[in-house]
């Protein structure tokens, strides 16, 4: 079952998945003035077992310019912009699938793909929340938001974490300092998680972001 | 409740334009595409194109590239078709749909064209 | 473009009958495969997705399966407020694609 809504809004706080539920879909989009492949995949799926779960299909872009069906309406300002370079020679840390039962990794990037990558959510995901460049973790119970199923109806659990303007960066649970565990976590948990460093932090994200249905993405 | 309200028919001459709503509302997530898809009187069903309303991306069938243009506000949390250069081949009934599995759908708009 | 065939245009069936509709894609489409039903007042919902995961809030006496490029919908045990038509889609390559659609009626 796919999440109706959005994770819970942090003030000055992002959140990353660490690992992808199977069922989940990552929409294949591409960045400004490229387009899909003709026939190619609309989205890409999580699939598979309790055993072993991967991404199906591939997103593939082609130049605009190849496709006469190109029609590009007036972009958005998050459209114009650009990946860090960064982001995309950082290599993906390997996860291992058997401790990840049901979960996929971060799919590796695919050539111009679009800024932000759109994920569809489903009911049992975890997401977690770190303070944005220059504030701090003040209070941290479970940093964390889980998709459930209540009464027919999807809602993200609230996450317990506020962030303060002091120029500290709180870390992700999985990018801690070896010898720190997150509060309120095994460390058998913390073990199996992905890290990934190509997080696009948005420090303009929780502070300001609409309620509109149409305003951001899954970031 | 996941919602999709389209007003109920629209009408326009030959050679004119027509622009239907989509307002979608009982959920808040910023991930779903809205579709578009066309019913022709006791005919199947053809996809038209899709729109990401946050960014503005949109995909188009081929065979309407020409004949639609989708667009989105994202204040209202609607969606929008144009279709152009209308002739009777354009009357049908138009839907918008949601997400990946188009899992939700308008009522339709009947679209006639008529002089 | 993927052409998804729906063979049978029209069947009759009884209140408790088991109904099966099948589709079949002019390729393999990986299970990418959804199933639709359009009441007669033009209602259309989402049955069945990604060939056999059945949509939230739809009876579990409807069922999909299949693979590669045929598939099926099963309606295990017939009610009246399952008179429709069914269209089959391929959702997942672009231009999704739909079948002609199989409207049931009752006998």
């Known amino acids: 079952e796919l999440c109706d809504d959005d994770p819970p809004e942090i003030p000055h706080a992002t959140f990353k998945a660490m690992a992808y539920k199977e069922g989940t879909m990552l929409n294949c989009e591409c960045k400004r003035g490229f387009r899909r492949i003709k026939s190619g995949s609309l989205y890409m799926l999580c699939t598979g077992n309790s055993s072993h779960s991967s991404w199906d299909n591939q997103c593939q872009c082609t130049s605009s310019a190849t496709r006469n069906t190109t029609k590009q309406v007036t972009p958005q300002p998050e459209e114009q912009k650009e990946r860090k370079t960064t982001e995309m020679q950082s290599p993906m840390q390997p996860v291992d699938q058997a401790s990840l039962p049901g979960h996929c990794r971060e799919p590796p990037p695919w050539e111009n793909e679009a800024t932000e990558r759109i994920y569809h959510f489903v009911v049992g995901q975890m997401v977690y929340y770190q303070c944005v460049q220059g504030y701090r973790a003040l209070h941290r119970g479970p940093a964390e938001s889980v998709c459930k199923m209540t009464h027919g109806k999807t809602r993200w659990t609230q996450p317990q974490l506020i962030c303060t303007g002091e120029m500290e960066t709180s870390q992700f649970p999985g990018e801690e300092k070896p010898q720190a565990s997150p509060e309120g976590r095994p460390e058998s948990e913390t073990s199996c998680l992905v890290t990934t460093t190509d997080f696009q932090i948005q420090t303009e994200m929780a502070a300001t972001m609409e309620t509109s249905i149409f305003t951001t993405e899954y970031q | 409740q996941v919602q999709l309200q389209q007003p109920g028919a629209e009408m326009a001459k030959p050679g004119a334009s027509v622009k239907m709503s989509c307002k979608a509302s009982?959920?808040?997530?910023?991930?779903?595409?809205i579709h578009w898809v066309k019913q022709r009187p006791g005919q199947g069903l053809e996809w038209i194109g899709y729109?990401?309303?946050?960014?503005?991306?949109?995909e188009y069938n081929q065979k309407f590239e020409d004949k639609a243009t989708l667009t989105a506000d994202k204040s209202s949390n609607t969606a929008y078709m144009q279709l152009n250069s209308l002739t009777s081949e354009d009357s049908a009934v138009y839907y918008c749909?949601?997400?990946?599995?188009?899992?939700?759908w308008g009522q339709g708009t009947t679209v006639t064209v008529s002089s | 473009d993927i052409q998804m065939t729906q063979t049978t245009s029209s069947l009759s069936a009884s209140l408790g009958d088991r109904v099966t509709i099948s589709c079949r894609a002019s390729?393999?489409?990986?299970?990418?495969l959804n199933w639709y039903q359009q009441k007669p007042d033009g209602t259309v919902k989402l049955l069945i997705y990604?060939?056999?995961r059945l949509h939230s809030g739809v009876p579990s006496r409807f069922s999909g399966s299949g693979s590669g490029t045929d598939y099926s919908l099963t309606i295990s045990n017939l009610e009246q407020e399952d008179i429709a038509t069914y269209f089959c889609?391929?959702?997942?390559?672009?231009?999704?694609?739909f079948g002609g659609g199989t409207k049931l009626e009752m006998k």
């Open positions: 390729q393999d489409i990986s299970n990418y």
């Open positions: 889609q391929q959702g997942n390559t672009l231009p999704p694609t």
């Open positions: 009982g959920y808040t997530s910023t991930a779903y595409w």
């Open positions: 729109i990401t309303p946050s960014t503005g991306y949109t």
């Open positions: 990604y060939t056999s």
């Open positions: 749909a949601r997400g990946g599995y188009f899992d939700y």
